[in-house]
Amino acid sequence: PPRGRILGGREAEAHARPYMASVQLNGAHLCGGVLVAEQWVLSAAHCLEDAADGKVQVLLGAHSLSQPEPSKRLYDVLRAVPHPDSQPDTIDHDLLLLQLSEKATLGPAVRPLPWQRVDRDVAPGTLCDVAGWGIVNHAGRRPDSLQHVLLPVLDRATCNRRTHHDGAITERLMCAESNRRDSCKGDSGGPLVCGGVLEGVVTSGSRVCGNRKKPGIYTRVASYAAWIDSVLA
């Protein structure tokens, strides 16, 4: 099943997020992703845990997963590079770089997103945008079109409380509020965008969604700048 969902959000403006990618397994949406360079998509390492025998592809330029759109194109993956320290049983280092079989054809609906290189926390309360094609309610309804939601960043101390994520949130992770509006598993790999810059990637660890005591967890890309640069080089 697809990993992730946007809860309490709404349909995104079509093609207003040209960096948005759908990471697909055997032709079905699996995870979100974000175009960070012409030939590279950033996603979450856990997304490919169960994909050993399947065909992984990346859909760019899409708003609807099913309808024909002039900007839509499915790319094969030349190389999948999970972060070397990512492990199945932790949320740490949950990043994956996918090299497309060729450079993406750029245009109004397909464009890389600048990503944060300055390793400094986003101020608590900052509203950030997260988007994805994950299920939109607890009944499991899957959207065909891209959904998004604005979420306030939550300070790490609150996220680390025993009743929240009990000390698991390292300096390389960040949190956003999850009170009925939330990202979750299936939006895993998708972008958390603050002020037009990629700040976080939705982690793909399992957790309840939409519960304010279990905030959304995002991998801070600035903390992994050296690794991203080394892979893209």
Epitope: N160, R161, R162, T163, D166, I169, K214
Partner: antibody, heavy 116, light 112 residues
Framework: EVQLQQSGPELVKPGASVKISCKAS????????MNWVKQSHGKSLEWIGD????????SYNQKFKGKATLTVDKSSSTAYMELRSLTSGDSAVYYC?????????WGQGTLVTVSA | DVLMTQTPLSLPVSLGDQASISCRSS???????????LEWYLQKPGQSPKLLIY???NRFSGVPDRFSGSGSGTDFTLKISRVEAEDLGVYYC?????????FGAGTKLELK
């Protein structure tokens, strides 16, 4: 290595106030709530309250409202607890403890003795 | 407030014995998020409390596997399979689910 270093023992007169400190090291101070716990001589432990070092937001045990005031100084990674209008019932060891999955890290304790 | 009642208050043991300490809460300490924040601490004379168990049954890093926690709802137990000299001290149960957070009165584990 996470360390919480508390200020030294205090001998104070009834009715006076005292401010004790807890200096954190070995982690990012703003990443965890700081809690304070009281232990009267030979007695159990009582939770006083907690503080979010990011914004100074506090939560108190109703029993200690008006008695204890929690503050932080982010620049020095130090948490403070002020106790006012002291009586003999406030004589105790006071601990700071960092919150995570639990109270895994504690200061060594500060003994406050209230005596005329 | 949630009252945490520990029994016994004193537990005389011989080295190598099994020891069992009970902790009962006056109401359920299952948090609204579904987790149960029941912890066990050991305090030796002149020292700060040390964490042994969190979330009912999870041993903190470095805690020997002779310590185990169990229970649910309102009834919890700490077991020490073979008591060693370094285990002597006062054991406290603690609930972190409801404010104010509360500790039990303590159980003193001592030699017979």
């Amino acid at each position: 290595e996470v360390q919480l270093q508390q200020s030294g023992p205090e001998l104070v007169k009834p009715g006076a106030s005292v401010k004790i400190s807890c200096k954190a090291s070995g982690y990012t101070f703003t990443d965890h709530y700081m809690n304070w716990v009281k232990q009267s001589h030979g007695k159990s432990l009582e939770w006083i309250g907690d503080i979010n070092p990011n914004n100074g937001g506090t939560s108190y045990n109703q029993k200690f409202k008006g008695k204890a005031t929690l503050t932080v100084d982010k620049s020095s990674s130090t948490a403070y607890m002020e106790l006012r209008s002291l009586t003999s019932g406030d004589s105790a060891v006071y601990y700071c403890t960092r919150e995570g999955a639990s109270f895994a890290f504690w200061g060594q304790g500060t003994l406050v003795t209230v005596s005329a | 407030d949630v009252l945490m009642t520990q029994t016994p208050l004193s537990l005389p043991v011989s080295l190598g014995d099994q020891a069992s300490i009970s902790c009962r809460s006056s109401q359920s300490i299952v948090h609204s998020n579904g987790d149960t924040y029941l912890e066990w601490y050991l305090q030796k004379p002149g020292q700060s409390p040390k964490l042994l168990i969190y979330k009912v049954s999870n041993r903190f890093s470095g805690v020997p596997d002779r310590f185990s926690g169990s229970g649910s709802g309102t009834d919890f137990t700490l077991k020490i399979s073979r008591v060693e000299a370094e285990d002597l001290g006062v054991y406290y149960c603690f609930q972190g689910s409801h404010v104010p957070l509360t500790f039990g009165a303590g159980t003193k584990l001592e030699l017979k």
